[in-house]
Structure formats: C-alpha cells, structure tokens
C-alpha cells in the first residue's frame, strides 16, 4: 500500500520506480458538494445522472460553481488547506456551490501513476459538467475550476474535454515534474478556459521544481519571483513550526499558492497587486511597477480577466503570512559622483516616513552594480501602508571587494577617524508607488549638503509630484 514520503528528494526517486509496485485501486472520482462551512460536515455526494441529490442538497443552478481539485497525495487523506479554501469560498460567495473533487484513490499512487490518472479525472469532471449543462439555468460561464499542484493539470484536462468553455481555471502552483515543456494538450494551458490565471510559488531553475516554471495561463503570477517564499526558509520553519525538515520547506512554498488565493478571498480589502515584467531580475530592479496598458492586476480570486493576454508573467513581493499584501515602491537614485571609493560597492538603506506610518530601515537590493553618474533603480516594499510619503532618510555602507581593500579602508579610518574619505553625492530620489501609481520626487533637505559618507544619513523631503520634465505629460492611471 502507498506509504508517506517527502515531496522533493523522494519524488525524484518516484519518477524512476518500476510500475510493478503500484497499488490496484477501484478507479473513482467523487464530487462532494460542501453544504456547510463546518469542515467536519460530510457534505453531499453528487452522482452523474441522478438529479435528486442536486435538489436534496440545495445545488443552486444560477449561482457560481467552484470545483476544488486536490493534487498528488502521500497520505491518501485531504490535506488541511482544503477546508480552509472551502470555508473562504463560502465566506466570499455565500450562494455559490462549492464542490470538492475527490480523486484520492487515483492520487494516492506513485507520482508517475498519479500523473497518468490526471486525464481520466479531468474527463470525469468534464462529464459531470456536461450533465449539469443539460439542466435549466446552469451556465458553464459560472464555473470556476481551482486546481492545486497536479489538480491544476486535472482542471486543464477538464476544461479541454468539456463541451463548451468553462468560465475560469485557477492553477495553484501547477505541478512541474512531467509537465514542464509538455504539449499544451497535456498540461494546463490558456485554451482550457475563458480565463486561466496561475500562481507559481515553488519553481526552481536547478534541482527538482515541484511547481511548473513555464507560464501556462493567460496571466502567470510569480510571488517573490516564484521561488523562495518568505516564512518558508529552513530558519523560519525551524522557528515557527518546529519542523525544520526540507520536506516542510517544500510543502510551505508549494502550498503558499493556496494561501495566497485564500487571502484574496477573505482579505478583499487588502488586495495584492502583481506587475507585468519580462523576468524576476528586472522586477527586483524596480523597473516593472507600471499599470499602464493592463500591466498590473490583482492576484488570486480578484484577478481581472485580461483581454488578448496570453502567458503574461507578473511579479510581486509578499509578506510571510496573511494578509500577504505589501506596498511596492520604485526608487530612482541618481548617484552624481563617487569620492575615494576604490573597490567599494555601496549598499543603500532607506527609511520611509509617511502620513500613516514610518517604515523600518530597508536595504535596497542590488541586482547589478551601482553606476556612477547614472540613475540607479531599486525596488523597495513595506509591510504597512505608510500613506503619503513625506520624507526619506538615506544611509549607505560599503562592502569591500577584497580583503586587501578592507584592510586599506580600515587603516585609513584608524589613521584619520574624522575624515570619512569616501563620499557619494545624491541630490534627489524619485519614488513611484506601485499601488497608487503616484510619482514623487524627493530633494535633499539641504541642497548645499548632498554628499554622504558611510554610516551617515542624508534626509530628503518631497519637492514635487511627478517626474515631469519639459514638454512631458504623465497619463493618469486607474488600478484594476
């Protein structure tokens, strides 16, 4: 019989196990209409061709219908995320039908066999939908399939096989192994529904990627670059959950997609926004915080259908837990000159002061070298809503490129402790808020004193709105 094993190390082994050890099971897919928010409630099982359970269980033909599709299982039981998602859907859409697709017997297999079963399960869902379409008032446009991991590809098959087009499929970290690079008919793809949105939370460019890396929807959202999720590092896991195993880290990151979706349902007033970008590095540089031409969108349930979009990669940063929303800022800092810099690479730190709150001291992540006499762009994000920005405090430190230079700097400092020596000249900082799309320019508080040495601080105050230069107009932007 199937036995538990950790998802990453052992999954790699699973892909190469002989077929002989698979378990013989009765092929079965069940549809459980969750009629109560109480997770213990047994719900109602729908049966193809039998209309009575639909009436007995109060299936609402005119309402939205959600099908939740789980993935591969090591234990053969429903995981804890399931009832969290059911409850969140019931909370958000009180009249909706929430159906759990139970394909546990076919998912509680070797991973390779579970993959081979996805087509059969997708077909079963399509047949159920075809039957429901025969009923008065039932519309396929009101159907939203939500698939986690392997379940995302099951949803793809269902959307492909059904007569007509389902309204929406949400892929929650669709499974990677055996699907990466696969033909569009053998994985989730934009053709499978009127709108296919995808959250990618466990992708790896080296090693085994549990989640699929390639874009497979109309919009593909990569929170935190789609790889390392905050609160899921080994240290976080050791601290907060006392687990400390790689398995738990994998589970935390893979399952984060579900929690981001749940967050979008229950924290409607705190929507997270993602921004279109060609790649994660450009996003980390703060280049991609535009909402023009539908370049930004809410994530999860609140995502807006983008017309003519296909495989649009979008990025955002998040907090480590619910509510996941953060506030993104693009910072443009023009470094006018270096003085006595040697081989020192500066690291900037900013503290933002706003009408609502002040941020912590935030490091500006350096994706590429800091350029002299050039405008350098950074991405900064805060966990709290600062309100309107009023002022910025900037400091910097130097990270030496070699031990020799470090010794040289130390010797110089010890011989002339009051002569800072190294200086940067920064006169203004331009800031753009991702969430409000507002652009502000901050000027040095003392225009005569714009040089800053390591460990010292420079203050900038708002000097004007926008970044307009001569003959330049700034379009007004509406967030979706």
């Amino acid at each position: 019989s199937p036995t538990p094993f950790g998802p990453e190390g052992q999954l790699a082994d699973e892909l190469h196990k002989p077929k002989a050890i698979q378990t013989e099971v009765k092929p079965s897919v069940r549809f459980n209409l969750r009629t109560s928010k109480d997770p213990e409630h047994e719900g109602c099982y729908l049966s193809l061709g039998h209309s009575q359970p639909l009436e007995d269980c109060g299936f609402n033909m005119t309402a939205k219908t959600f099908f939740i599709i789980h993935g591969w299982t090591m234990s053969g039981i429903f995981e804890n995320w399931l009832h969290k998602l059911v409850s969140a859907l019931h909370t958000r859409e009180k009249d909706a039908n929430v159906v759990v697709v139970d394909w546990l017997p076919l998912a509680h297999q070797l991973y390779t066999d579970a993959v081979n079963n996805t087509r059969v399960v997708g077909h079963s869902i399509a047949r159920m939908l075809d039957w429901l379409q025969e009923k008065d008032d039932f519309s396929l446009g009101n159907v939203h399939l939500i698939g986690y991991s392997l379940g995302a590809h099951v949803a793809g098959y269902a959307g492909n096989f059904v007569k007509g087009t389902v309204g929406r499929i949400t892929g929650l970290d669709p499974a990677g192994p055996m699907f990466e690079g696969a033909d569009i008919h053998k994985r989730l793809s934009p053709d499978d529904a009127d709108f296919v949105d995808v959250l990618h939370t466990y992708t790896r460019s080296f090693g085994l990627s549990i989640g699929i890396q390639m874009p497979v929807g109309h919009i593909d959202i990569y929170p935190n670059g789609g790889d390392f999720q905050p609160g899921c590092g080994l240290n976080d896991v050791l601290g907060s959950m006392a687990y400390g195993t790689i398995t738990e880290v994998v589970k935390c990151e893979h399952e984060r997609a579900v929690h981001l979706f749940v967050d979008s349902l229950v924290n409607q007033d705190k929507p997270s926004f993602a921004f279109q970008c060609t790649d994660s590095n450009r996003f980390k540089k703060g280049i991609c915080l535009s909402c023009r031409k539908n370049r930004c969108n809410s994530i999860g349930y609140n995502a807006k259908k983008m017309r003519n979009k296909r495989n649009s990669k979008m990025y955002l940063k998040t907090r480590a837990g619910m509510p996941f929303r953060v506030y993104h800022y693009q910072m443009k800092i023009h470094v006018f000159s270096y003085k006595n810099m040697g081989e020192i690479e500066p690291t900037f730190y900013v503290t933002l002061y706003g009408t609502n709150a002040d941020s912590q001291t935030l490091p500006l992540e350096i994706v590429e070298r800091i350029e002299q006499n050039a405008t350098n762009t950074f991405l900064v994000y805060t966990e709290e809503d600062l309100g309107d920005l009023l002022k910025i405090q900037l400091t910097w430190e130097g990270a030496s490129q070699s031990w020799y230079n470090l010794w040289k700097e130390l010797r110089s400092y010890l011989s002339q402790p009051h002569n800072p020596g190294r200086e940067l000249n920064i006169r203004r900082i331009r800031v753009k808020s991702g969430e409000t799309q507002r652009k502000l320019t901050f000027c040095a508080e003392d225009p005569e004193n714009t040089s800053i040495s390591p460990g010292r601080e420079l203050w900038f105050r708002k000097c004007r709105d926008g970044w307009r230069m001569k003959n330049e107009t700034s379009p007004t932007v509406e967030l979706p």
């Epitope: 019989s1 199937p2 538990p4 378990t23 099971v25 009765k26 079965s28 069940r30 459980n32 969750r34 109480d38 997770p39 213990e40 409630h41 047994e42 719900g43 099982y45 090591m74 234990s75 053969g76 039981i77 429903f78 995981e79 804890n80 995320w81 399931l82 009832h83 969290k84 059911v86 759990v100 139970d102 546990l104 017997p105 509680h108 907060s240 959950m241 006392a242 687990y243 929690h259």
Partner: antibody, heavy 120, light 112 residues
C-alpha cells in the same frame, strides 16, 4: 443513532489468523474513513492506520505493515482487521473509530473494542 | 513522527477541585490558525470518548466543565469542578496533516 459494533472477544494460538469486524450504522459508511487502534493490556492507545471506505485503499503505520490487513464489505457497511501469523504481543484490545475525510480528522465515534488474547 | 508527551502520568484531585493535564508535542501541530490536537477520555473496559477537538472545541454532549487550550506544541486539558464520574485515563492526539497520527501516553485521573 451512529454506532460502530465490533465482533466479540477472540482467543487464538500463536501462528493463527484472526479477523475482527466493525459494523457501522446510522450514517453513510463510505463517507467517513475507518481507523484501527490497538491498546495492549494496561497500555496506551496506538494508531494502526486507516482504510478509505469508498476506494478500499488501506494505509498502515510502520509498526503494522506486513501481518496486518484492513478490508471492507461495503454492502454490509463493515470494516475488517485481519492479523496473520499471530504473536503473543498481539494480545490487546482493538478498536475501530471513524473520522471525517474533510475536517480535522479526529475520531468522533468508536467501536466498543474487541479483545484478542494470543496464548499457546 | 510527532511525539506527544503527557504529564503528569497520574494525578489525584479532590472532588470539586481543578484537574490540569498537559500535553507537549515534539513539533507544532498548528496549521494556519488551527491546532490539530484533540482530547479523549477512556474509562476501564470502555472505548475512548472524544471530549475536545481542535484544541479548544467542546464535542457536543460533553459537560462544560471540560475545557481545552493551547497552541503550537503546548496544550492543556482542564476539568473544573472535577466530579466523581471523571475518574478515567485521558489521552491527547494530534492529526496534523500527513499521518502517522499519534496519541499521548495517557494521564490517569483519580478522585480523592
């Protein structure tokens, strides 16, 4: 009302086989998983594993792999625990207990227990 | 596997007083705000009976003198005021996600 009724006490010799039954009533049998729990004399509770009552797929904990088998007779709403090649250390009371597939997996209803004595 | 350690192994409490039983888990049994820790009562010759589920929820039909609390790795079952019929062995159990699910070693409560 919901009930789980187990078969009566068993006295067996080492090397023999025993099959304990657990008949469910008052609810839809296939809508809840069935657990098996062992309690040796004067000892605590030890979870042996469970069986999916719809698919018939059993899951065993490491200590109960090999000689132990969970099975079903769905039409009779009955779950079975079979122990082969009995050993003295199998002497215990065995309980069946149901749990909800969808919730937090606690065991809300239990059978009265079947006492198995293995002695030569 | 998650190991549950109950303490004390046994305790004697006077009628009407408070009985407090502790259960410590080797790992957190919390998941997204819920604690997957449950408490059972077992009297001699009887099967266990569910008292508290998800750390603090009282099972229907169980008297309100039973209460559960805790999160993460530390959980407590309180009985107040203790009655004669509460003499039994009490077990904690965790069912956090992937099996194996485990029971604590039990605490025997005697009424003085």
């Amino acid at each position: 009302q919901i009930q789980l009724v187990q078969s009566g006490p068993e006295l067996k010799k080492p090397g023999e086989t025993v099959k304990i039954s657990c008949k469910a009533s008052g609810y839809t049998f296939t809508n809840y998983g069935m657990n098996w729990v062992k309690q040796a004399p004067g000892k605590g509770l030890k979870w042996m594993g469970w069986i999916n009552t719809y698919s018939g797929v059993p899951t065993y904990t490491d200590d109960f792999k090999g000689r132990f088998a969970f099975s079903l007779e769905t039409s009779a709403s009955t779950a079975f625990l079979q122990i082969n090649n009995l050993k003295n250390e199998d002497t215990a009371t065995y309980f069946c207990a149901r749990f909800s597939y969808y919730g937090r997996h606690y065991f809300d209803y239990w059978g009265q227990g079947t006492t198995l004595t293995v002695s030569s | 596997d998650i190991v549950l350690t109950q303490s004390p192994a046994s305790l004697a409490v006077s009628l009407g007083q408070r009985a407090t039983i502790s259960c410590k888990a080797s790992q957190s049994v919390d998941y997204d705000g819920d604690s997957y820790m449950h408490w059972y009562q077992q009297k001699p010759g009887q099967p266990p009976k569910l008292l508290i589920y998800a750390a603090s929820n009282l099972e229907s039909g169980i008297p309100a003198r039973f209460s559960g609390s805790g999160s993460g790795t530390d959980f407590t079952l309180n009985i107040h005021p203790v009655e004669e019929e509460d003499a039994a062995t009490y077990y904690c159990q965790q069912t956090n996600d992937d099996p194996p699910w485990t029971f604590g070693g039990g605490t025997k409560l005697e009424i003085k």
